[in-house]
Each structure stands twice: as structure tokens, then as C-alpha cells.
């Protein structure tokens, strides 16, 4: 029942809630919005002035088992002539996501949530120049 | 499905795919990594395709704050600091997984939810369509 509600028994758990052992939580990994798709511009990883490659990391004890990581192709950025300009820097852009990790301890299996950092692409930045006194 | 070898002495010697529902330990690994991109780097200002960061807040989601990038310009910043419209600033999008309480009134029951976020922007050469 939603807040506020008259005549509500605040401390009573609804019957429909699953029993959960202490120190854990029930997690349904049937994903909400599973069929949502990324609608990025075409081939931006190749057309970018800070292009990148994709690598698929695969781990059967992680859900989802496939995580795609980007790696910048160059230290510098690609200029209008298609050459690398090392006066600029290609840098990774990162984003956190949650995964579920399966752990085996002897014959028992446990599950743990984990935050992982995914590199999603690269951008071209002006370098920070440190002047030495 | 993929099978994973297990200790041969265990009663069920193979683990197949992840079950639909799992009991998860409360401790979240790497929970305290920095989630604010404004604090972790200033790429959003130094990029040739700079972006602004907007807080997407939902107290009933974990994590409750997700930062969304919006490109500042259609074009990219050139060496003179001006916007060059011969190039395009485009968002880099990523699907991430978050937690949502489900059923919503239950204290210890959650479901994974996939959401699409724009993480930053990159400068690209435009696709030019020639009209016959």
C-alpha cells in the first residue's frame, strides 16, 4: 500500500512478499526493458576523431555474461587530414553498471551484486599542461 | 546453455545458466567507487564535443542518481575555440543495469532493470547523403 493510507498496519509485511533469509535479498534477473535497444548514430566508433575498438569480455559466472568494453585506438586524435594529432588526447568515457557475480565455495554457490566500470567510447580532449617551475 | 565444470564431489556437478531468481548477498562489491562524473574527470568541459551533465534522480531505484550527458553543440569545437559545423557532436549511449524494488511494497525483493543512458559525447565526421 502506498504512503499515505488511512488505517494502515505499518509493521505488517504483505502476504505476497517472498520470504528472504537475513543478510540477503531476492533478485529477479528477468530484466525490465530487456528489449530496449541503443539507437546511437551509425559507426560512431570509426567516424569519431577519437576512434575506438570494441572487445567483448565473457564470464560465465557473471550476469550478464557478456560485457562490451571500448578501447581508444590512438593516444592522440584524428585531424581533418586523417592523421593523428598528438597535441590532443583520445580519452575513455566510463560508466558504472551492476552485474551479478556467481561464486563457488566448495559445493555451495552464492550470488553477489557487483558494480563494474564499463568503457563505452572515447572523446577527444585538450590536454592538461603542467608547467614545471 | 553453457556448462561450467564444478567440483566432481558435489551432488550436482554442473551449473547451467543463471536461475531466473537468485538470493543475493547484501554486500555489493565495489559499491563505493566514485559515481559522480563531475568529480572523477573534467572531460565534459575539455572535449571537442563538450557536454552538460544532468542528474537523473529516482529515490526508488538503485543507484538513485544517474548522470545523463547532453551535447552542448551540434558541431565540434575547433582549435580556435569556435563551433565547427562540418563536424558533429553525438552522444555515446550505453545500456546499464539498475535495481528496482519488485513487488514495490516488498522489503527485500528486487528486479534488474535496463536503462539507456547518454554517458558523454564524441566528435564525428558527418555522414553526407548525396541527392541524385
Amino acid at each position: 500500500r502506498k504512503i499515505p493510507k488511512v488505517g494502515h498496519t505499518f509493521f505488517q509485511k504483505p502476504e505476497s512478499c517472498p520470504p528472504v533469509p537475513g543478510g540477503s535479498m531476492k533478485l529477479d534477473i528477468g530484466i525490465i526493458n530487456e528489449n530496449q535497444r541503443v539507437s546511437m548514430s551509425r559507426n560512431i566508433e570509426s567516424r569519431s576523431t577519437s576512434p575506438w575498438n570494441y572487445t567483448v569480455t565473457w564470464d560465465p559466472n557473471r550476469y550478464p555474461s557478456e560485457v562490451v568494453q571500448a578501447q581508444c585506438r590512438n593516444l592522440g586524435c584524428i585531424n581533418a587530414q586523417g592523421k593523428e594529432d598528438i597535441s590532443m588526447n583520445s580519452v575513455p568515457i566510463q560508466q558504472e553498471t551492476l552485474v551479478v557475480r556467481r561464486k563457488h565455495q566448495g559445493c555451495s554457490v552464492s550470488f553477489q551484486l557487483e558494480k563494474v566500470l564499463v568503457t563505452v567510447g572515447c572523446t577527444c580532449v585538450t590536454p592538461v599542461i603542467h608547467h614545471v617551475q | 546453455g553453457i556448462t561450467i565444470p564444478r567440483n566432481p564431489g558435489c551432488p550436482n556437478s554442473e551449473d547451467k545458466n543463471f536461475p531466473r531468481t537468485v538470493m543475493v548477498n547484501l554486500n555489493i562489491h565495489n559499491r563505493n567507487t566514485n559515481t559522480n562524473p563531475k568529480r572523477s574527470s573534467d572531460y565534459y568541459n575539455r572535449s571537442t564535443s563538450p557536454w552538460n551533465l544532468h542528474r537523473n534522480e529516482d529515490p526508488e531505484r538503485y543507484p538513485s542518481v544517474i548522470w545523463e550527458a547532453k551535447c552542448r553543440h551540434l558541431g565540434c569545437i575547433n582549435a580556435d575555440g569556435n563551433v565547427d559545423y562540418h563536424m558533429n557532436s553525438v552522444p555515446i549511449q550505453q545500456e546499464i543495469l539498475v535495481l528496482r524494488r519488485e513487488p514495490p511494497h516488498c522489503p527485500n525483493s528486487f528486479r534488474l532493470e535496463k536503462i539507456l543512458v547518454s554517458v558523454g559525447c564524441t566528435c564525428v565526421t558527418p555522414i553526407v547523403h548525396h541527392v541524385a
Epitope: 502506498k2 | 559515481t35 526508488e60 524494488r101
Partner: nanobody, 123 residues
Framework: EVQLVESGGGLVQPGESLRLSCKAS????????LGWFRQAPGKEREGISC????????YYTDSVKGRFTISRDNSKNTVYLQMNSLKTEDTAIYYC????????????????WGQGTQVTVSS
């Protein structure tokens, strides 16, 4: 024993301030969102503020926005409610409650509740 204990209530005049504390024992607040609720005599319980577990983002009901501030100190296993510019209509029993990971608009989602502390605002 798992419990939440509120303190800091009392009798104040309108316009004055109070700081409520809620200390958890028997469990760690690290993975819990903390909410403050209040119940005035003859009225239903209302949620007034919540602070998330992931990034300590704070949320408030309209009637207390700008006057109340929720904060947490995980090292002390405590959550606070700083109440400024108190009004007579803030008179109520104040409860704190803990919900796993996220705030919720459902009372039932809160696993642990305190016994409450009385706040009276009167001239």
C-alpha cells in the same frame, strides 16, 4: 538485537530548531535508505524525508522542504533530521525507518522501524 532508536525530540517554540537522531544497532545502515515519518494525533502517518543508500541523495515532502535537512553518518550508524523554523503543525511523533537499498513510497518496504520520539511545537 536489531533496532532503531530515535532521540532529540522535545518541546520547542515556533520558529525554533531541533535535531533528531536515529541510531541503528544490530545491523549496518550501509545498504539501507533511511526515512523519517511522523504521525500527529488523529492523523495518518506521513513520510516526510528519505536519504538514499547509494549516494546520500535527500528527498522531502513539500510541507518540510527548505526547513528540514536529512543527513547520514554511516561510520556512526546514525541518520539525522535537522528541523529549522518549526511550526505548530510539525507537532507529531517522529519515527525513523530503514528500507533496503532504495527509498520507497510504501510503508511495507521499510524493514526496520524505531519506536518514535515526540516533537511538540507550541507557544
Amino acid at each position: 538485537e536489531v533496532q532503531l532508536v530515535e532521540s532529540g525530540g522535545g518541546l520547542v517554540q515556533p520558529g525554533e530548531s531541533l535535531r533528531l537522531s536515529c541510531k541503528a544497532s544490530g545491523f549496518s545502515l550501509d545498504y539501507y535508505a533511511l526515512g523519517w515519518f511522523r504521525q500527529a494525533p488523529g492523523k495518518e502517518r506521513e513520510g516526510i524525508s528519505c536519504i538514499t543508500s547509494s549516494d546520500a541523495s535527500a528527498y522531502y515532502t513539500d510541507s518540510v522542504k527548505g526547513r528540514f535537512t536529512i543527513s547520514r553518518d554511516n561510520s556512526k550508524n546514525t541518520v539525522y533530521l535537522q528541523m529549522n523554523s518549526l511550526k505548530t503543525e510539525d507537532t507529531a511523533i517522529y519515527y525513523c525507518a530503514a528500507a533496503l537499498l532504495t527509498c520507497s513510497s510504501y510503508y511495507d518496504a521499510y524493514t526496520y522501524w524505531g519506536q518514535g520520539t515526540q516533537v511538540t511545537v507550541s507557544s
